[in-house]
């Protein structure tokens, strides 16, 4: 059986400022289980955007649903975007693990810009 | 408003244990990596340790084995523990709320950690 | 570990002139330097990041440059709160993240 893939199809998306934006991700397996996070940055500083399993993301929506059997696509979407959104977006999978989930396979990364607000 | 404030400074003898606490507050501090960086009297910044948003822990090489860096989301509170404290630990302990560009965007005021006989 | 050298030590400028010191890394960090101001009695702040972009409100008169090993922080023209100590940092994706020894920029 082929491992896990974590594939981000878009390596750069451009959004203009005040929109939605659309990050995509899907996995090539259900195997292994465990949670998907979304991050900013792939440093030890990385900041958290959207966590399956827990947390408080206002912004953040899913673009399908993920507790749906068999459901491959982890894509997200962030409300009202601004520059300081800028950067760039990681989709990473966790191994469920004990007592802590560990680390898998993370997506490639896609870079968001923000364009100036049309007058 | 972004907010750090650090507790549990002190004067101790060397060998002995401290913790300090760091409480967070004005953003949502799961989210975030955050650190400890410390300056000994009239010198530099050192960074001594942190902690990642999923727990994964960082050390200096000048505290490792002898400093722990932990956090508990549910109070918002960054954590070090130190022991077998030594007199060169002596200075000004600050946390500070991490970018994901990884530098160090708010500081607390600090706590001075005394090492001496 | 990536050793960040900083110089002068001291500098003295006359409030309204202008400021260059410098930061030279060990090896090479790219772009991932950032510069950090520090008062007497005072928490470090954060001036600028990935060597020339300025953190949120921070004047304009604070700019950086440089990349690879070499760096350089300018105050275009002083005032008086800009006495104070100026610190280099690597902020490559991992730790250790190393502070140069500081820059004290005082009153001529």
């Known amino acids: 059986e082929d491992e896990l893939q974590v594939i981000q199809p878009e390596k750069s998306v451009s959004v203009a400022a005040g929109e939605s934006a659309t990050l995509r991700c899907a996995m090539t397996s259900l195997i292994p289980v465990g949670p998907i996070m979304w991050f900013r940055g792939a440093g030890a500083g990385r900041e958290l955007i959207y966590n399956q399993k827990e947390g408080h993301f206002p912004r953040v929506t899913t673009v399908s649903e993920l507790t749906k059997r068999n459901n491959l696509d982890f894509s997200i979407s962030i409300s009202n975007i601004t520059p300081a959104d800028a950067g760039t977006y990681y989709c990473v999978k966790f191994r469920k693990g004990s007592p802590d989930d560990v680390e898998f396979k993370s997506g490639a990364g896609t870079e968001l810009s923000v364009r100036a607000k049309p007058s | 408003d972004v907010q750090l404030v650090e507790s549990g400074g002190g004067l101790v003898r060397p060998g002995e244990s401290l913790r300090l606490s760091c409480a967070a507050s004005?953003?949502?501090?799961?989210?975030?990596?955050v650190t400890w960086v410390r300056q000994a009297p009239g010198e530099g910044l050192e960074w001594v340790s942190l902690i990642s948003v999923t727990g994964t822990t960082y050390y200096a090489d000048s505290v490792k084995g002898r400093f722990t860096i932990s956090r508990d989301n549910s109070k918002s509170t960054l954590y070090l523990q130190m022991n077998s404290l030594r007199a060169e630990d002596t200075a000004v302990y600050y946390c500070?709320?991490?970018?994901?560009?990884?530098?160090?965007?708010?500081w607390g005021l600090g706590t001075l950690v005394t090492v001496s006989s | 570990e990536i050793v960040l050298t900083q110089s002068p030590g001291t500098l003295s400028v006359s409030p309204g002139e202008r400021a260059t010191f410098s930061c030279r890394a060990s090896?090479?960090?790219?772009?991932?330097l950032a510069w950090y101001q520090q008062k007497p009695g005072q928490a470090p702040r954060l001036l600028i990041y990935?060597?020339?972009t300025r953190a949120t409100g921070i004047p304009a008169r604070f700019s950086g440059s440089g990349s690879g090993t070499e760096f350089t922080l300018t105050i275009s023209s002083l005032q008086s709160e800009d006495f104070a100590v100026y610190y280099c940092q690597q902020h490559t994706d991992w730790p250790p993240y190393t502070f140069g020894g500081g820059t004290k920029v005082e009153i001529k």
């Open positions: 004005g953003f949502t501090f799961t989210n975030y990596a």
């Open positions: 090896q090479t960090v790219g772009s991932k």
């Open positions: 500070a709320k991490v970018t994901w560009k990884n530098v160090f965007d708010y």
């Open positions: 990935d060597a020339n």
